[in-house]
């Protein structure tokens, strides 16, 4: 029934104080996306993008999280505490729920490599 696949930016690294784009993409399904949830490693919700209501950024992250591009999320003013797992959850009809995982490593180094390849988790 669930024919789709989630592609994500996979394992990425970014510099402390910088910004990073978290991106997921759902493909290979006819299902309609009604909502996308973005969660942090401790399962706290960062943001929700509802098809009808648009974006809602949770208050604790309002200053450092920007919606987009697309259904993705931009994290700004990165700190070392931002290191960890991030999850995108796609709620779709009639397939159900698809979930993607991204691991972000925030580096002290001024020469942090920022890799953003797409991969299937």
């Amino acid at each position: 029934m669930m024919t789709g696949t989630i592609e994500t930016t996979g394992n990425i690294s970014a510099k402390k104080g910088g910004s990073v784009i978290l991106q997921c993409h759902l493909s290979s399904t006819m299902a309609q996306v009604t909502q996308v949830n973005w969660e942090q490693h401790d399962h706290s919700l960062l943001a929700i993008r509802n098809a009808e209501l648009g974006w809602h950024i949770y208050p604790a992250f309002k200053d450092r999280v920007a919606p987009g591009p697309g259904l993705g999320l931009t994290l700004q003013s990165l700190t070392m505490n931002d290191t960890g797992e991030y999850f995108c959850t796609y709620h779709t009809y009639p397939d159900g729920t698809y979930r993607g995982r991204i691991f972000l490593e925030v580096l002290e180094s001024s020469v942090a490599e920022h890799s953003a390849r797409f991969q299937i988790p």
């Epitope: 029934m1 006819m30 299902a31 309609q32 996306v33 009604t34 909502q35 509802n50 098809a51 009808e52 709620h91 779709t92 009809y93 009639p94 159900g96 729920t97």
Partner: antibody, heavy 122, light 106 residues
């Protein structure tokens, strides 16, 4: 007010075609999937299929392929059901129904059209 | 396809009665179940979704329970306007409806 308003009753001869419309108002049409449900006289509800209102991709349920076509005109927030080569057994009330809920367990058909009676008789 | 079997098909009851309708799924559907009420000549109306969540505006005498393969719709105290046909629907995969339960006045 959120509502779905369907076109009026139709009387058709066998072999003819019919196109039923379902006009949405009070919400963003492209944000919610649309379903079609058939109810033959004195019978229960049968899910016919659905259309992705964002992409226009239709999906037909088993038993409703070939002669049954779902389409959209997003500019007027309207979904359509076209049935070709009508048969007497197509006589039924046809409903459009929106999928409400953000996702997960919350999905359900929260808004229904009033129904369109299609009678096929020679 | 997932089949839903409703029981009973017909139910006679009186105003004030407590009634229970059962819906059994041919395989586990977690809580992906909704209940609808339909009156003659009218479109179905959503009563309950997610097996037990009451739709906005629906009286609290209606309640739903269950998970997996067995679900129930309960009306705690029947009112005259409750005499109608009730359908369960699964949304775990492509939707299907139960055969319906016609609730009649005794």
């Amino acid at each position: 007010e959120i509502q779905l308003v369907q076109s009026g009753s139709e009387l058709k001869k066998p072999g003819a075609s019919v196109k039923v419309s379902c006009k949405a108002s009070g919400y963003t049409f492209t944000s919610y999937p649309m379903n079609w449900v058939r109810q033959a006289p004195g019978q229960g509800l049968e899910w016919m299929g659905w259309i992705n209102t964002n992409t226009g991709n239709p999906t037909n349920a088993q038993g409703f392929t070939g002669r049954f076509v779902f389409s959209l005109d997003t500019s007027v927030s309207t979904a359509y059901l076209q049935i070709s080569s009508l048969k007497a057994e197509d006589t039924a009330v046809y409903y459009c129904a929106r999928v409400g809920g953000y996702g997960g367990y919350d999905y359900a058909f929260d808004i229904w059209g009033q129904g369109t009676m299609v009678t096929v008789s020679s | 396809d997932i089949q839903l079997t409703q029981s009973p098909s017909f139910l006679s009851a009186s105003v004030g009665d407590r009634v229970t309708i059962t819906c059994r799924a041919s395989q586990g559907i977690s809580s992906y179940l909704a209940w609808y009420q339909q009156k003659p000549g009218k479109a179905p109306k959503l009563l309950i979704y997610a097996a037990s969540t009451l739709q906005s505006g629906v009286p609290s005498r209606f309640s739903g329970s269950g998970s997996g393969t067995e679900f129930t719709l309960t009306i705690s105290s029947l009112q005259p306007e409750d005499f109608a046909t009730y359908y369960c629907q699964q949304l775990n995969s492509y939707p299907t409806f139960g055969g319906g339960t016609k609730l009649e006045i005794k």
